[in-house]
């Protein structure tokens, strides 16, 4: 690897730095589908990017393997929690790969934020954060589910959402 | 762009690069000000420091346009609540921007700590992180807000802090 | 600082750019001791790895110096809460440094969790995400202790983590 | 400026049960917890329990728990204490008192309410 | 519960005079390096007063001659020159944990 090389390898590096892959997804009406299927995210407007990142279907979809550190946000809340419901709420950040048929738990949170809000009147908020640095391949996509989805409040794209950056 | 253009952007980079971006400020006796402004924050002792970022009555200003990972935590705590289990604590990071007269809300939680209190112990511990990535110019500013701050708790700078970092 | 030394350092840069110090550890059926150490973490299997930094211990162990976003999240839970336990749960991430006899607490969280469970047979779950920007010299270490750790709750290293990245 | 008004006294039988009203005046009414404490004859002052106006949560002393109630009537700013079964040992001045800003302590008071029960 | 205990039941002081309360608590009132104590005043025939709000606290409008400190289980309320406005009876009051619960009090009254 010569000078020319190095040298070609350096301007190359310094054009992929001033791209070094980030997202941030935000929260939406159409987040929440009731499909079963992960959630869905705004990708351009507010304060929503995609940078040297794509997105399908609720997921961001890696263009340049590497380390990325990917984070979610979401924001839990209720009047009384719906009967029936098991008291825990299970938010997680999940890998699709083309090298294997289902999903892949990444980064989980495990909540029991109904616990107090015992009357069918009481109102009560939680949140539910998550982050952590994974490696991710070209082509590899990551997505955010939460069950019970009910009880993902949305409103502005600020409360719920979700990001990652490469490290 | 000839080879010495690039040569002066590669040093240029490279001095930038050792100075990328960084903050992280933190919780003091002096934070809480009961005025309905934003939280202030220690940004020289202890664990606390501001490179390539400065400060301004609790706002991070930022001098090189960019992507950053901002982040917050506040600890919350009290002996029961002042509105009772009803009590809402509302976390923010918000950008004051010259070109706009209004703080823009760019992440923001809602919890109900107080039901953490047991029905003969009123003491209670909650805390609340954000973090996400956002673009912000120079000369933008990002301030840390809590509603109601009578229950964010100070100590020692290790459980409230407010940081960013370019990404 | 000629020409030559410029590119040296150049490439020095861009190889030492290329292993941005990265780790993610994970929790394991082995973290929970409980001697009153740190927890202790798996450091390949899995989503675990280590890059630039290494492990002893329980501690990630800085190997290049600079400012790091390092990270953990437990998972807690539980059936009702331990007979005599205080209500609160303490999460944090220590410093070891040679220079110092003792621990140095960096980011610290509380949290009620068994509020959440009202009453003794209740199974309640609850999450504790910390992260921010510390600056670490080589050989300085990092550890996550959790008082009291008899409530995390670890299964398959996506719950309980401990990670940095220099930023 | 903050007023806390209270009802009349009350002369009632062993038995009987009294209800006490407390009528807030002068500050956000739906702000502030509204605790309750008596003041027995030759006693000290004694905690009855709390009442959160903005929702209508109680928190009630154990001593009292099954023969007191507390309401509220957000739209005229007023607390009530009911008190049943009543019996001599009852016999108090009964205070409704503000919860502070910082709500652990009771900066104002009501100027009490005298309830004899004698048969 | 946790039982508050004053001392002396009786204090007689002269106007002019420095008088010291006591109070103590069954277990530590303290959250978070802050006292849940507060002293109140009352004399006959009228609601009682706050004076002093998580052990060290002045409420507002009340005189700088009274003063609050202690922590943990033992607190002490002092009137550094009594008035005659201050003969009354005196109550330390802890707010950690429910049932909040008084002192028996202190009686304040003209040597």
């Known amino acids: 690897d010569g000078p020319a090389g190095s040298w070609e390898q350096l301007i190359q590096e310094r054009r992929s730095h001033e791209v070094n892959p980030a997202a941030h997804l935000t929260g939406a009406n159409s987040s929440l589908t009731g499909s079963g299927g992960p959630l869905l995210w705004e990708t351009q407007l507010g304060l929503a990017f995609l940078r040297g990142l794509s997105y399908h279907d609720g997921a961001l979809v890696v263009t340049k393997a590497g380390y990325y550190y990917i984070y979610s946000k979401v924001q839990l809340g209720g009047v009384g929690c719906p009967l029936g419901l098991a008291s825990t709420i299970t938010h997680g950040l999940y890998k699709r790969t083309p090298r294997y048929p289902e999903e892949l738990e990444l980064l989980v949170s495990q909540q029991s934020p109904c616990g107090r809000a015992t009357s069918s009147s009481r109102v009560w908020w939680d949140s539910s954060f998550l982050g952590g640095v994974v490696h991710l391949e070209a082509g590899e996509e990551v997505v955010v589910r939460v069950l019970d989805e009910r009880l993902v409040r949305l409103r502005d794209g600020t409360r719920s959402y979700f990001g990652a950056f490469m490290v | 762009d000839g080879p010495a253009g690039s040569w002066e952007q590669l040093i240029q980079e490279r001095r930038s690069h050792e100075v990328n971006p960084a903050a992280h400020l933190t919780g003091a006796n002096s934070s809480l000000t009961g005025s309905g402004g934003p939280l202030l924050w220690e940004t020289q002792l202890g664990l606390a420091f501001l490179r390539g970022l400065s400060y301004h009555d609790g706002a991070l200003v930022v001098t090189k346009a960019g992507y950053y990972y901002i982040y917050s935590k506040v600890q919350l705590g009290g002996v029961g609540c002042p509105l009772g289990l009803a009590s809402t604590i509302t976390h923010g990071l918000y950008k004051r921007t010259p070109r706009y007269p209004e703080e823009l809300e760019l992440l923001v939680s809602q919890q109900s700590p107080c039901g953490r209190a047991t029905s003969s112990s009123r003491v209670w511990w909650d805390s609340s992180f954000l973090g996400g990535v956002v673009h912000l110019e120079a000369g933008e500013e990002v301030v840390v807000r809590v509603l109601d701050e009578r229950l964010v708790r100070l100590r020692d700078g290790t459980r409230s802090y407010f940081g960013a970092f370019m990404v | 600082d000629g020409p030559a030394g410029s590119w040296e350092q150049l490439i020095q840069e861009r190889r030492s750019h290329e292993v941005n110090p990265a780790a993610h550890l994970t929790g394991a059926n082995s973290s929970l001791t409980g001697s009153g150490g740190p927890l202790l973490w798996e450091t390949q299997l899995g989503l675990a790895f280590l890059r630039g930094l290494s492990y002893h211990d329980g501690a990630l162990v800085v190997t290049k110096a600079g400012y790091y976003y390092i990270y953990s999240k437990v998972q807690l839970g539980g059936v009702g809460c331990p007979l005599g336990l205080a209500s609160t749960i303490t999460h944090g991430l220590y410093k070891r440094t040679p220079r110092y006899p003792e621990e140095l607490e960096l980011l610290v969280s509380q949290q009620s969790p068994c509020g959440r469970a009202t009453s003794s047979s209740r199974v309640w779950w609850d999450s504790s995400f910390l992260g921010g920007v510390v600056h670490l010299e080589a050989g300085e270490e990092v550890v996550v202790r959790v008082l009291d750790e008899r409530l995390v709750r670890l299964r398959d290293g996506t719950r309980s983590y401990f990670g940095a990245f220099m930023v | 400026q903050v007023q806390l008004v209270q009802s009349g006294a009350e002369v009632k039988k062993p038995g009987a049960s009294v209800k006490v009203s407390c009528k807030a005046s002068?500050?956000?009414?739906?702000?502030?917890?509204m605790n309750w404490v008596r003041k027995a004859p030759g006693q000290g002052l004694e905690w009855i329990g709390r009442?959160?106006?903005?929702?209508?949560?109680?928190n009630y002393n154990q001593k009292f728990m099954g023969r007191v109630t507390f309401t509220v009537d957000r739209s005229t700013s007023t607390v009530y204490m009911e008190l049943s079964s009543l019996r001599s040992e009852d016999t108090a001045v009964y205070y409704c008192?503000?919860?502070?800003?910082?709500?652990?302590?009771?900066?104002?008071w009501g100027q009490g309410t005298l309830v004899t029960v004698s048969s | 519960e946790i039982v508050m205990t004053q001392s002396p039941a009786t204090l007689s002081v002269s106007p002019g005079e420095r008088a010291t309360l006591s109070c103590k608590a069954s277990?530590?009132?303290?959250?978070?390096?802050?006292?849940?104590m507060n002293w109140y005043q009352q004399k006959p025939g009228q609601a009682p007063r706050l004076l002093i709000y998580s052990a060290s606290n002045l409420e507002s409008g009340i005189p700088a001659r009274f003063s609050g400190s202690g922590s943990g289980t033992e607190f002490t309320l002092t009137i550094s020159s009594l008035q005659s406005e201050d003969f009354a009876v005196y109550y330390c009051?802890?707010?950690?944990?429910?049932?909040?619960?008084f002192g028996q009090g202190t009686k304040v009254e003209i040597k």
């Open positions: 008192g503000r919860g502070s800003y910082y709500w652990n302590a009771m900066d104002y």
């Open positions: 009442i959160y106006p903005v929702s209508g949560e109680t």
């Open positions: 002068g500050y956000t009414f739906i702000d502030h917890i």
């Open positions: 009051q802890q707010s950690i944990e429910d049932p909040w619960t």
């Open positions: 277990q530590s009132v303290d959250f978070d390096g802050d006292s849940y």
